[in-house]
Amino acid sequence: EVTLLDSRSVQGELGWIASPLEGGWEEVSIMDEKNTPIRTYQVCNVMEPSQNNWLRTDWITREGAQRVYIEIKFTLRDCNSLPGVMGTCKETFNLYYYESDNDKERFIRENQFVKIDTIAADESFTQVDIGDRIMKLNTEIRDVGPLSKKGFYLAFQDVGACIALVSVRVFYKKA
């Protein structure tokens, strides 16, 4: 495997693009069991209907790979565990990509992104000890291809879930 993006290995802030700029996805630093900061993106607007919060990564080179794999580690709150939000709370988010030769796209319209999949929390999860808390970490992998441009952007669309993206890794498999 060749890694193209690993959010856990980025030094400092990830600085991905959130839309809207305020009130949607927020970058939040948490400490792992070794007291090392993990950069996460979180959103939990479960009280208000019709949420449409987007988060876009930086440009990711494909390094000639025809097909890439996206591994997302995330936590997703069960709506039943959040008091009194059943009508508006959701338990999925959407994953998109946009191919581009331009590594500095300033603005990408929502309708330019191609949907990869709707992601839900699996029944299986990894329990991760962080201090005195247990984090239930889901892992989902999706692939996309064939790719033709020099690189691409990923986007995550929140529609009203309580979610934290803990790790995003993009890789391809060497022949």
């Epitope: 305020e22 939040v28 400490m31 939990c44 565990s81």
Partner: nanobody, 118 residues
Amino acid sequence: QVQLQESGGGLVQAGGSLRLSCAASGFASDAYAIGWFRQAPGTKREMIAAVTKAGATNYANPVKGRFTISRDDAKNMVYLQMNNLKPEDSAVYYCNAISPLWDEYDFWGPGTQVTVSS
């Protein structure tokens, strides 16, 4: 050790105002948001307002436009300004952390009683 102490409740006439305060300490710095919740007799607890670390706010429909949540991180305080109160706002009000990371509420403060008379 998480400590939550709500205050500011009381008896008020319909159309009146109250300002609730929550002294919150012991939360990890990764608490994404602080929220206000309420529970009326015979009903389930409901989340009514939240303010994130970055200061973004959101509200449940029954209180939108009437209640305002704010936070003062320097003082570890969260506030709920309640205007144009209605009898159906009568409940015990609680504050707590809201986090996508943790799936349990293992500690609640005593709450503060709000009673709105008609």
